[in-house]
């Protein structure tokens, strides 16, 4: 039985050209996290494997940094980065937990700076 829950940063906004941390946290389970995948709707951004470490997809290598922790830092943001991001926790023995974050990248300085995991 899957008892865990994923807490995410929820809906966040950031300025074009800036950086943002995508962060998820799995709680309420003793399951072992074997891998965390970070994905957009149609492509893989990165994988953090418990044995093998981080793999950043080639198309994101120049502007995605691993961490902090199991999170992911997106740099040099563009308006095209607006959209849904998913953290997918592969665990044993529970199975898969998925969290969703919506990022809006804004043209000007109207971006909110109050998001809990956001880089100022």
């Amino acid at each position: 039985m899957m008892t865990g829950t994923i807490e995410t940063t929820g809906n966040i906004s950031a300025e074009k050209g800036g950086s943002i941390i995508l962060q998820c946290h799995l709680s309420s389970t003793t399951a072992q996290v074997t891998q965390v995948n970070w994905e957009q709707q149609d492509q893989l951004l990165a994988i953090c494997n418990a044995d093998l470490g981080w793999h950043i997809s080639p198309s994101f290598k120049d502007r995605v940094a691993p961490g902090p922790g199991l999170g992911l830092t997106l740099q040099s943001l563009t308006v095209n980065d607006t959209g849904e991001y998913f953290c997918i926790y592969h665990t044993y023995p529970d199975g898969t937990y998925t969290g969703r974050i919506f990022l809006e990248v804004l043209e000007s300085s109207v971006a909110e700076h109050g998001a809990r995991f956001q880089i100022p």
Epitope: Q35, N37, E39, D42, Q43, L44, I47, N49, A50, D51, L52, G53, W54, H55, I56, S57, P58, S59, H90
Partner: antibody, heavy 121, light 107 residues
Amino acid sequence: DVQLQESGPGLVKPSQTLSLTCTVSGHSFTSDYAWSWIRQPPGKGLEWIGYISYSDSTNYNPSLKSRVTISRDTSKNQFSLKLSSVTAADTAVYYCARLDYGNYGGAMDYWGQGTSVTVSS
Amino acid sequence: DIQMTQSPSSLSASVGDRVTITCRSSQHVSTALAWYQQKPGKSPKLLIYSASSRYSGVPDRFSGSGSGTDFTFTISSLQPEDFATYYCQQHYITPWTFGGGTKLEIK
């Protein structure tokens, strides 16, 4: 250039343990790579057996997990495969391969030439 | 485990032809998909990883595309040395699994 070379007996009796070694040359064995075993039965496709990481963590295919052990000897630049209780279904060409996970994920970039193992009495 | 299905299982073509092989996964694998070339009696060679990234030294006539569960591998203009068997592999989650292979033969 990185080179991998499998070695071990070409014939193993049913119920015995298959033991293979992969020797890595042209490469620092202690750096951030993982090392994998893959097999290919005659005329068939490829099956991933498992890996050992740079930190000595192992991960095995669940279909073989109860029979497989992968270990390494950094002083000899070698890693090995042991597969117990073999049957004719374990007859295959066995390959060792390198995992450069940071760059290529779980795609394997360097392979040995393979060694053929037949299980027969 | 994630099952990988390749089609066709065999294919006849001529030098200069454009050839396309498809690979379908039984579950979502995002863009974590690799393609290998294997010639008889030889070990597989990595051609494509992360669905569309060419491995170092691989000619640009080889390309890959797709995401999710449906993937395509294309050789834009077949050369004599390209006749071989091609395998897809998902590297999304262990156990990493391979397709059954596509044997590319001379017509």
